[in-house]
């Protein structure tokens, strides 16, 4: 499944939210929508 990140400090991995430390800007991919900074 897709993996992508939110700039509020968590990422979706295997369709669940888990916390991570770094932030990723929206220049790293397409905006997913209806999230906080989710890009893929």
């Amino acid at each position: 499944d897709a993996e992508f990140r939110h700039d509020s400090g968590y990422e979706v991995h295997h369709q669940k939210l888990v916390f991570f430390a770094e932030d990723v800007g929206s220049n790293k991919g397409a905006i997913i929508g209806l999230m906080v900074g989710g890009v893929v």
Partner: antibody, heavy 121, light 111 residues
């Protein structure tokens, strides 16, 4: 202005495949994922998945896994949703959509006009 | 998967009166103090339109009579003074986790 324009209605036999297109304009194509949502006649909304025009990565609703494929063509700013092994229950209007992320200000959504896919023998 | 349940299925309200629609999630749709809960309006023959996002925030161009409340698993959409153009089906949706899921919809009619 942002526009998502979908391909026309389709009639398919059970077991066949259908490929619906969604052509984006009015913004930089690679900056927003495109989602697909379907609606059976008189029924509610069902999220099918999305694809990223930036990376080509897709995320599918497990309900459709193995039957749905979402792709993009960056040269024409078009996203495709192909559904295979069609059955009568797949008769629905299929929408493509684009959403903003939650910001501090506002969120906009943009939808295609919908494509009716009828599965009938 | 998160299951979204709406009530009632349909609602008849007099013009100018308040309409209230409820939505319950099978598990919390909150994360980092944000509720990933959205409301849509769909009129016949049209695609859905985002009314409310993050449980309480109004979408672009949405009239002030539409408001959302709630957190965790229980949410409410309120139309403070029903207008004729508000006749539609309303859906809640969670975007906390994939697969995104919608409630079954609530049809709002004029009494």
């Amino acid at each position: 202005q942002v526009q998502l324009v979908q391909s026309g209605a389709e009639v398919k036999k059970p077991g066949a495949s259908v490929k619906v297109s969604c052509k984006a304009s009015g913004y930089t194509f690679t900056t927003y994922a495109i989602h697909w949502v379907r609606q059976a006649p008189g029924q509610g909304l069902e999220w099918m998945g999305f694809t990223s025009p930036y990376s080509g990565v897709s995320n599918y609703n497990q309900k459709f896994k193995g039957r749905v494929t979402m792709t993009r063509d960056t040269s024409t700013s078009t996203v495709y949703m192909e559904l295979s092994s069609l059955r009568s229950e797949d008769t629905a209007v299929y929408y493509c959509a684009r959403f903003d992320n939650y910001p501090r200000g506002y969120v906009r959504d943009y939808w295609g006009q919908g494509t009716l896919v009828t599965v009938s023998s | 998967d998160i299951v979204m349940t709406q009530s009632p299925d349909s609602l008849a309200v007099s013009l100018g009166e308040r309409a209230t629609i409820n939505c319950r999630a099978s598990e919390s749709v909150d994360n980092d103090r944000i509720s990933f809960l959205n409301w849509y309006q769909q009129k016949p023959g049209q695609p859905p339109k985002l009314l409310i996002y993050a449980a309480t925030k109004q979408g672009t161009g949405v009239p002030d009579r539409f408001s959302g409340s709630g957190s965790g698993t229980d949410f409410t959409l309120t139309i403070s003074s029903l207008q004729a153009e508000d006749v539609a089906v309303y859906y809640c949706q969670q975007s906390k986790e994939f697969p995104w899921s919608f409630g079954g919809g609530t049809k709002v009619e004029i009494k």
